[in-house]
């Protein structure tokens, strides 16, 4: 806390300018009129202030709107948003897009904090769903924005703000994430011919279905080995020798190196060893010839 | 009066990770972000990491990326950089400094860290 | 990124002579900038912020000014401990960066 004194004669600020640079802490909360702050924000930016200058204007700030800054105030913020904490932040009202694109631009190349995770929850809720300009902007600046979401807020975002997303956007996703955005995606490309389709939906399809997967199959997609390996390994497991053939194309010869891991593993597990065999890879492990094989869960589907 | 103090440099191989200390005195530590710099050998200064007095900000210099991390104990008054997957062009001496927004107003005396086979 | 770049790389000058050592910012940097001078084996040490502020203990015969783009530090007569490299450096934005060096050597 900045203790009270007079302004000393003639420092009395009469603009926000680059004078102030060279004033104390306590000059600065004595002769800095809160209200000339507020009005002149977009000037503060210009000025290279101390971040212990900064402080006092933000204590300013704060005095003078003790209920949240305004969005005209907020908008300006620049340099001083990196000295607001998440409390201050959830004060706010953020309701425009371009407010938004200001702050965050102020912390571009920094590692998500907890005030850009308040202010991005803050303008998201504010707007009701995560729209697709919205989403736009967020994945611009932070790509992996969306593999930071629940399962339950990324049911919030519509089938048409998909097309925003791209590739890397995703990296980060788990399986449950996944299953939420692939129906989105399915619907939001499904206007789309065969390898467009399968161009757009490929990031999406750790949360494909099997029947989705014996779909893709029929299509001459040639899937690569790093999209089949990032599937579900229960959407995987079913799938014939010939269906994954069809699948992956020319990359199935891929399989081998990835014999060992799930989910060419588990797979490798469920299949007959002839049926392995006519890939001509020498894949191991399949069940052998002449055993047979029972689906129990079929079974105790049944009983 | 204000010191800054760096320690943990030394040899490593290519790939191989390393902890820097910075001790600070003679000021209150938790009121401050601070710095990481670097120099490589014969060569100008880069600025590759900084934190805010509560940690809650931060910044990593693209070169540093995924493989730097930047901490702080402000019971300790202490800050630190743990360096993971070093490559050769990381040799530098490595500076701890003040940081006050506009510039740097303190620094340490660098400790050096060579990356070699 | 803003590149800083500093000329003249290096300058050999004697001791009374006035220095003008120059920054150019690839963009507007306001007055965001500070001066720093190294000693061989030395951390650098702060001179001028907000490109004219001189700290407090650095003698009156360093300056600093200019604002935008274009910015110099004058040595206004060279004294004996005043040959060092000397950096720019800017912080209008992330991440911050600074100039190659001027070296300062006795002629």
């Known amino acids: 806390e900045v203790e009270k004194t007079a302004c000393p004669s003639g420092k009395k600020a009469r603009e926000i300018d680059e004078s102030l640079i060279f004033y104390k802490k306590w000059e600065l909360e004595a002769c800095v009129d809160a209200a000339l702050l507020a009005t002149q924000m977009d000037r503060v930016n210009a000025i290279p202030f101390t971040y212990e200058q900064l402080d006092v204007l933000k204590h300013k700030l704060d005095e003078l709107y003790p209920q949240g800054y305004p969005e005209s105030v907020i908008q300006h913020l620049g340099y001083l948003f990196l000295k607001m904490s998440p409390e201050d932040i959830r004060k706010w009202n953020v309701t425009s897009l371009e407010t938004l694109k200001a702050l965050l631009e102020v912390n571009k190349g920094h590692e998500m904090s907890p005030q850009v995770a308040t202010l991005i929850d803050r303008f998201v809720k504010g707007r009701g769903q995560l729209d697709k300009d919205t989403l736009d902007t967020l994945t611009a600046f932070y790509p992996g924005y969306l593999c930071s979401l629940s399962p339950e807020e990324l049911s919030s975002v519509p089938p048409s703000s998909i097309w925003a997303v791209r590739p890397q956007d995703l990296d980060t996703c788990d399986p449950r994430q996944l299953d939420v955005l692939y129906p989105k995606a399915r619907l939001a490309f499904q206007n789309m011919n065969g390898s467009e389709y399968f161009v757009k939906i490929q990031s999406f399809l750790g949360g494909a279905p099997t029947e989705d997967l014996k779909a893709l199959s029929q299509q001459n997609v040639s899937m690569d080995l790093a999209t089949f390996m990032k599937l579900r390994t229960d959407a995987v497991l079913p799938l014939t020798v010939a269906e994954v053939q069809k699948l992956l194309g020319p990359h199935v010869e891929g399989l081998k190196a990835e014999e060992r891991h799930r989910p060419v593993r588990d797979w490798i597990l469920r299949q007959r060893q002839d049926d392995l065999d006519t890939l001509g890879l020498g894949l191991q492990g399949g069940i052998p010839n002449g055993y047979l094989v029972l689906d129990l869960s079929m079974q105790e589907a049944l009983s | 009066q204000v010191q800054l103090v760096e320690s943990g440099g030394g040899l490593v191989k290519p790939g191989g990770s390393l902890r820097l200390s910075c001790a600070a005195s003679?000021?209150?530590?938790?009121?401050?972000?601070m710095s990481w710099i670097r120099q490589a050998p014969g060569k100008g200064l880069e600025w590759i990491s900084y934190?805010?007095?509560?940690?809650?900000?931060?910044y990593y210099v693209d070169s540093v990326k995924g493989r730097f991390t930047i901490s702080r104990d402000n019971a300790k008054n202490s800050l630190y950089l743990q360096m993971n997957s070093l490559r050769a062009e990381d040799t530098a001496v490595y500076y701890c400094?003040?940081?006050?927004?506009?510039?740097?107003?303190?620094w340490g005396q660098g400790t050096l860290v060579t990356v070699s086979s | 990124d803003i590149q800083m770049t500093q000329s003249p790389s290096s300058v050999s000058a004697s001791v009374g002579d006035r220095v003008t050592i120059t920054c150019r910012a690839s963009?507007?940097?306001?007055?965001?900038l500070a001066w720093y001078q190294q000693k061989p084996g030395k951390a650098p040490k702060l001179l001028i912020s907000a490109a004219s502020r001189l700290q407090s203990g650095v003698p009156s015969r360093f300056s600093g000014s200019g604002s935008g783009t274009d910015f110099t530090l004058t040595i206004s007569s060279l004294q004996p401990e005043d040959f060092a490299i000397y950096y720019c450096q800017q912080a209008k934005s992330f991440p911050r960066t600074f100039g190659q060096g001027t070296k300062v050597e006795i002629k």
């Open positions: 400094a003040r940081d006050v927004g506009s510039h740097f107003d303190y």
């Open positions: 934190i805010s007095s509560s940690e809650s900000i931060i």
């Open positions: 003679g000021f209150t530590f938790s009121d401050y972000y």
């Open positions: 963009q507007d940097i306001s007055r965001w």
